[in-house]
């Protein structure tokens, strides 16, 4: 009675192909003959089981990185089968948005390129989708802006699809820096104020980064020594009637408002004295 290790051991995938990430995979360890009988099986990289019934291995929720599996049938000796490739297919992984240019901060008017990167995909054939606020913007791996504007600022996502599924990047915030714009002078309580009362002029603007320095001017372009967003005149005089404008400055540049006219009228007491 000649004893010998199990012969012609093979690892057989029982599942229909292809295998997708998350599937339950069943593998069997087959052999041709063995003397003495097979008493246990070993699986690489899944460990060893003593019962012969474990000639079948079930892998629940197979991972994208489960690559190869091999089994051994053992009596007094172990015979290893050649490894089989599971060839698990999976949706694109580690999708992210990367800014290619400019290398520094983005200023209005810059040419900007965003790249949709991913680490791996199986199958390799993929499609790209770019989205901002739920609106489809493009279907290339890059999203390009010839001349970026403040309106292009916002939250961008890219999606990478293959036949298995689609994966979205984290939202990526595109910040556009621009000089103050849309400046205007608003007046409170209004643009007509009685002498002796208070008038507040506010320099309103849209800027990124926010305005760091305000300068106020009168209709002769003479600067007033006020450098905050609000110019409070109290008590206001009839002589302060006139048009005023403001200039806002940030690290990108400066912008100016159109003229706004303040009319200061005499109080009834003043008129009565005249």
């Amino acid at each position: 009675d000649v004893q010998y290790p199990p012969k012609k051991v093979t690892t057989v995938i029982q599942n229909p192909m292809p295998i997708r990430e998350g599937d339950t995979v069943t593998l069997s360890c087959n052999y041709n003959s063995s003397n003495p009988s097979v008493t246990r099986y070993e699986w690489k990289p899944h460990g060893a089981w003593e019962e012969p019934s474990l000639g079948v291995l079930k892998i629940q929720n197979v991972g994208w990185d489960n690559t190869t599996i091999a089994c051994a049938a053992c009596n007094s000796w172990c015979s290893w089968a050649s490894p089989v490739a599971l060839n698990v297919q999976y949706a694109p992984r580690d999708v992210r948005v990367r800014k290619i240019k400019p290398l520094s901060e983005i200023h209005s008017g810059n040419s900007v390129s965003l790249q949709c990167d991913f680490s791996s995909s199986h199958p390799k054939e993929v499609q790209f989708f770019w989205e901002k606020n739920g609106r489809l913007l493009g279907k290339e791996s890059q999203l390009n802006f010839d001349s970026i504007s403040p309106e292009d600022a916002g939250s961008y996502s890219c999606w990478v699809n293959n036949s298995i599924g689609q994966t979205a990047s984290k939202a990526w915030t595109l910040e556009v820096l621009y000089a103050p714009r849309r400046l205007r002078v608003s007046m409170s309580p209004g643009d007509q104020v009685m002498e002796g009362k208070s008038a507040t002029l506010t320099c309103e603007s849209d800027a990124n980064p926010p305005v760091s320095h305000y300068t106020w001017f009168d209709w002769n372009n003479q600067s007033l020594p006020y450098h905050s967003q609000k110019l409070r005149l109290e008590p206001v005089k009839v002589q302060h009637s006139g048009a005023y404008w403001c200039q806002g400055t940030n690290s990108v540049g400066k912008g100016r408002s159109p003229l706004s006219t303040l009319t200061v009228y005499y109080s009834p007491e003043t008129i009565g004295r005249r």
């Epitope: 300068t215 009168d218 002769n220 003479q222 007033l224 005089k237 400055t249």
Partner: antibody, heavy 118, light 116 residues
Framework: EVKLVESGGGLVLPGGSLKISCAAS????????MYWIRQTPDKRLEWVAY????????FYPDSVKGRFTVSRDNAKNTLYLQMSRLQSEDTAMYYC???????????WGQGTSVTVSS | QPVLTQSSSASFSLGASAKLTCTLS???????IGWYQQQPLKPPKYVME???????HTGDGIPDRFSGSSSGADRYLSISNIQPEDEATYIC?????????????FGGGTKVTVLG
């Protein structure tokens, strides 16, 4: 009645430091921008510091920039001028003044005299 | 930066009218200036804010004898019926902002003497 009272002047050695103060009363100090102005022995007036009502913005002429620092404590209704690396040319009467509504200084203090001499 | 030019002195007879001039450098000819009075051994006192159109705001306690007017780059301070207490140095000043840097400049002042 608007009142501005300067104090802290005196004799100081060249290269030395001095801090002068201006106590304000009779108006809402925190609403107004304030100046320090000096009058040199030849009677010329020279603006030396300007500070916004909040203290956020400060301005200086080149002659004192980096040596003088203006500050204010709105809770104490007080304006300050810290002067360092003093030179003989800084000898003057120092006035604090309130900025009026638009273009001019509408109230001035009595002044405090600073003499830089060895 | 703006430059303010004033004549150094002027004499007037008691009760006469006086007219002092402060001239702005040409590119600042439309600017509003401040007029200040400094009596001997006293601090400067605000007299008025004077615009290029001649309109003005006069300081508290300034007599009606004081008025202002403008012509081009010239700003005038007029004193009618001049009195001994009007003997003082009259200084003009103007503010401006250049490259985000605020500045305030003064003229050299005109010393007014009242005769008689």
């Amino acid at each position: 009645e608007v009142k501005l009272v300067e104090s802290g002047g005196g004799l100081v050695l060249p290269g030395g430091s001095l801090k002068i103060s201006c106590a304000a009363s009779g108006f809402t100090f925190s609403d107004y921008y304030m100046y320090w102005i000096r009058q040199t022995p030849d009677k010329r007036l020279e603006w030396v510091a300007y500070i916004s009502n909040t203290g956020y913005s400060t301005f200086y002429p080149d002659s004192v920039k980096g040596r003088f620092t203006v500050s204010r404590d709105n809770a104490k209704n007080t304006l300050y001028l810290q002067m360092s690396r003093l030179q003989s040319e800084d000898t003057a009467m120092y006035y604090c003044a309130r900025h009026g509504i638009l273009y001019a200084m509408d109230y001035w203090g009595q002044g405090t005299s600073v003499t830089v001499s060895s | 930066q703006p430059v303010l030019t004033q004549s150094s002195s002027a004499s007037f007879s008691l009760g006469a009218s006086a007219k002092l001039t402060c001239t702005l450098s040409s590119q600042y000819s439309t600017y509003t200036i401040g007029w200040y009075q400094q009596q001997p051994l006293k601090p400067p006192k605000y007299v008025m804010e004077l615009k290029h159109d001649g309109s003005r705001h006069t300081g508290d306690g300034i007599p009606d004898r004081f008025s202002g007017s403008s012509s081009g780059a010239d700003r005038y301070l007029s004193i009618s019926n001049i009195q001994p207490e009007d003997e003082a140095t009259y200084i003009c000043g103007v503010g401006d902002t250049i490259k985000e840097q605020f500045m305030y400049v003064f003229g050299g002042g005109t010393k007014v003497t009242v005769l008689g």
